[in-house]
């Protein structure tokens, strides 16, 4: 899982992914549900080696969170070829893996 710390790094990560699915976890250190789902998110990055997993701390990277219109945490966004192809909010393990499977 790659930690994103700037808007430039975020754009570069999307560009570098090519045709691969990119999953972005928008979270915060003070967010309980974010902490709860983090180990599962990391396990998915091992299970789905053909998917790019990114993490954005909304406090450290407010410009990315703002550009992606993140309103609550955790929010998971899904990108393909630089385009957003899916999004949902909440620490929902089942929906997270289901969405990856549908979009991969």
């Amino acid at each position: 899982v790659k930690q994103i710390e700037s808007k430039t790094a975020f754009q570069e990560a999307l560009d570098a992914a090519g045709d691969k699915l990119v999953v972005v976890d928008f979270s915060a250190t003070w967010c309980g549900p974010c902490k709860m789902i983090k180990p599962f998110y990391h396990s998915l990055s091992e299970k789905y080696s053909n998917v790019i997993f990114l993490e954005v701390d909304v406090d450290d990277c407010q410009d990315v969170a703002s550009e992606c219109e993140v309103k609550c945490m955790p929010t998971f966004q899904f990108f393909k070829k630089g385009q957003k192809v899916g999004e949902f909010s909440g620490a929902n393990k089942e929906k997270l893996e289901a969405t990856i499977n549908e979009l991969v």
Epitope: E94, K95, E102, V104
Partner: antibody
Framework: EVQLQQSGAELVKPGASVKLSCTAS????????MHWVKQRPEQGLEWIGR????????KYDPKFQGKATITADTSSNTAYLQLSSLTSEDTAVYYC??????????WGQGTSVTVSS | QIVLTQSPAIMSASPGEKVTMTCSAS?????MYWYQQKPGTSPKRWIY???KLASGVPARFSGSGSGTSYSLTISTMEAEDAATYYC????????FGAGTKLELK
């Protein structure tokens, strides 16, 4: 405890429509995708499609596009499957299912639909 | 859309015998799922993530495979294992195999 309770058996005439229901208990349907699966007599399982009840987003196997319509009512925690222009090919047991990725997943008891004049 | 081909369609085994059934996918998939179904009942999750046993599944069952080739094995057949087994993949459009009916000899 998670349970999926499906509506009762249906005997319908060719050309008619039927709407099956699947009421969930023990979890909120907004939290996952609800799937529908068809099983014709003595045959295998066929995935019809699924709904994301949180936003109404649906996806169908192309084979069932136009035949099946999946909806959900989050206030009653219920998913629905409507089948239109019924023929004998639609005679089957229809299951709603919570197809999870973990050790457990959950299926309704099935609803038998018989199309006969 | 990924097509899953199961073989054999029907097989029979004596108690104590080793049983292997296969499932071939038309394209590469990440993980295979297996269901057991007995007449008049809903399918039951049997194996998930290719090789993990669902809760309550006896240790004599195992799953393996990768890419396009997967299998379910019973090390020693027991009478209660007689059922139909379906493989299932969870890509963008989920699909099931046609099933392998396992009968007791």
């Amino acid at each position: 405890e998670v349970q999926l309770q499906q509506s009762g058996a249906e005997l319908v005439k060719p050309g008619a429509s039927v709407k099956l229901s699947c009421t969930a208990s023990g979890f909120n349907i907004k939290d996952t995708f609800m799937h529908w699966v068809k099983q014709r007599p003595e045959q295998g399982l066929e995935w019809i499609g699924r709904i994301d009840p949180a936003n109404g987003n649906t996806k169908y196997d192309p084979k069932f596009q136009g035949k099946a319509t999946i909806t959900a009512d989050t206030s009653s925690n219920t998913a629905y499957l409507q089948l239109s222009s019924l023929t004998s090919e639609d005679t089957a047991v229809y299951y709603c299912a919570l197809l999870q990725y973990s050790a457990m997943d959950y299926w309704g008891q099935g609803t038998s639909v018989t199309v006969s004049s | 859309q990924i097509v899953l081909t199961q073989s054999p369609a029907i097989m029979s085994a004596s108690p104590g015998e080793k049983v292997t059934m296969t499932c071939s996918a038309s394209s590469r998939i990440s993980y295979m799922y297996w269901y057991q179904q007995k007449p008049g009942t809903s399918p039951k999750r049997w194996i998930y993530d290719t090789s993990k046993l669902a809760s309550g599944v006896p240790a004599r069952f195992s799953g393996s495979g990768s890419g396009t080739s997967y299998s379910l094995t019973i090390s020693t057949m027991e009478a209660e294992d007689a059922a139909t087994y379906y493989c299932h993949q969870r890509s963008s459009y989920p699909t099931f195999g046609a099933g392998t009916k396992l009968e007791l000899k």
